[in-house]
């Protein structure tokens, strides 16, 4: 599985999770959110060669008519395939709120 | 919805489903299939920008990051949502056999 | 390479005031929050309030009951720690820290503050 | 506020041996937690963030572990370098409360 744990411990080139770190103020311009002030989000990177974890028959399709047709631009993407929650801290009025913000983190990747 | 009733008859520069016609043999190397020579199994490409069919709240965080750091290489993908099957013809010794293949059409795209 | 040094020890009368600096460097001091935390003579770490250099916003202690005030000049790329209405308690190194990743990650090198008529 | 509260208070303790140290938050605080080291008249020192990641430059005999409201650092092979007075901190809605220390 292109998970953490396989991506983050690799050097691999083809498609991947990638380790990103989303500060909320900085990166989103949200002031909403109290806690955490950001979050490892992560992403997927990287090319989708043919049998690379492909996600659907269409994905094996285009790979392979890639592969026989270099310059297209259609080709499969990589994409997040599991996605986890991220709890947050908000506030309503001097209320302190605890919410779980789902999809919020990429944990796998797959080529779409 | 980003589907070929609107992507076909638009000149949409943002993530959309585009006309793409694939022969089995020349495209994919595949003579098992008899029927049909190719078909239109269509393709996703387009930029992914802020609010632009976000498949998942991750989705509309990495596109906000990417407004914010626009040199960045984390981003949203255009992506294949609807997706469907093509019935195909193809032999057991001389015995015709008709099955449907799943999953080989884009009908819809999404950025995920 | 991130390095936070704060301004020297500081002697105050009570009911006097004490503004602390710590001058930084090495990242991008607009965009991470500024923790400040002290710690009394043998006692423990008491985290005092947060200012985000960016816009100004900050968090405070509410054991501190308004005695406390952070402030940033951007300008320098430095933060204020300004404590009044001081009392023999307050006599403690005050720190700043950076803010990274749900942590402090980066500390100053501390200011002792003492307290006496 | 949420209240944490370390054990032991202090440990004495020979070279070589595991040293496991805990910290309880009065309430769910996820994994927003970090640990710190602090020597005798030294500033504290981040060893662990996000309750379980070991910060740059730490050596890997420490390590965290822990979710929600129990948590705990671990040294897996003392060394004389490692006396000093650790700190538990959470991160999880101000004030950012530390625990009282362990020496």
């Known amino acids: 599985a292109l998970d953490t744990n396989y991506c983050f411990s690799s050097t691999e080139k083809n498609c991947c999770v990638r380790q990103l770190y989303i500060d909320f103020r900085k990166d989103l311009g949200w002031k909403w959110i109290h806690e955490p002030k950001g979050y490892h989000a992560n992403f997927c990177l990287g090319p989708c060669p043919y049998i690379w974890s492909l996600d659907t028959q269409y994905s094996k399709v285009l790979a392979l008519y890639n592969q026989h047709n270099p310059g297209a631009s259609a080709a499969p993407c990589c994409v997040p395939q599991a996605l986890e929650p991220l709890p947050i801290v908000y506030y309503v009025g001097r209320k302190p709120k605890v919410e779980q913000l789902s999809n919020m983190i990429v944990r796998s990747c797959k080529c779409s | 919805a980003l589907d070929t009733n609107y992507c076909f008859s638009s000149t949409e520069k943002n993530c959309c489903v585009r006309q793409l016609y694939i022969d089995f043999r020349k495209d994919l190397g595949w003579k098992w299939i008899h029927e049909p020579k190719g078909y239109h199994a269509n393709f996703c490409l387009g930029p992914c920008p802020y609010i632009w069919s976000l498949d998942t709240q991750y989705s509309k965080v990495l596109a906000l990051y990417n407004q914010h750091n626009p040199g960045a290489s984390a981003a949203p993908c255009c992506v294949p949502q609807a997706l469907e099957p093509l019935p195909i013809v193809y032999y057991v010794g001389r015995k015709p056999k008709v099955e449907q293949l799943s999953n080989m059409i884009v009908r819809s795209c999404k950025c995920s | 390479e991130v390095q936070l040094v704060q301004s020297g020890a500081e002697v105050k009368k009570p009911g006097a005031s004490v503004k602390v600096s710590c001058k930084t460097s090495?990242?991008?001091?607009?965009?991470?929050?500024m923790n400040w935390v002290r710690q009394a003579p043998g006692a423990g770490l008491d985290w005092m309030g947060q200012?985000?250099?960016?816009?100004?916003?900050?968090n405070y202690n509410g054991k501190f009951k308004g005695r406390v005030t952070l402030t940033a000049d951007t300008s320098t790329s430095t933060a204020y720690m300004e404590l009044s209405s001081l009392r023999a308690g307050d006599i403690a190194v005050y720190y700043c820290?950076?803010?990274?990743?749900?942590?402090?990650?980066?500390w100053g090198q501390g200011t002792l503050v003492t307290v006496s008529s | 506020e949420i209240v944490m509260t370390q054990s032991p208070a202090s440990l004495s303790l020979s070279q070589g041996e595991k040293v496991t140290i805990t910290c309880r938050a009065s309430?769910?605080?996820?994994?927003?937690l970090a640990w710190y080291q602090q020597r005798p008249g030294q500033a504290p020192k981040l060893l662990i963030y996000?309750?379980?990641n070991l910060a740059d430059g730490v050596p890997s005999r420490f390590s965290g572990s822990g979710s929600g409201t129990d948590f705990s650092l671990t040294i897996s092979s003392l060394e004389p370098e490692d006396v000093a007075v650790y700190y538990c901190?959470?991160?999880?809605?101000?004030?950012?409360?530390f625990g009282q220390g362990t020496k």
């Open positions: 820290a950076r803010h990274y990743d749900g942590s402090t990650d980066y």
């Open positions: 090495g990242y991008t001091f607009i965009s991470s929050w």
């Open positions: 200012i985000y250099p960016g816009d100004g916003d900050t």
């Open positions: 309430e769910n605080i996820y994994s927003n």
């Open positions: 996000a309750a379980t």
């Open positions: 901190q959470h991160f999880w809605g101000t004030p950012y409360t």
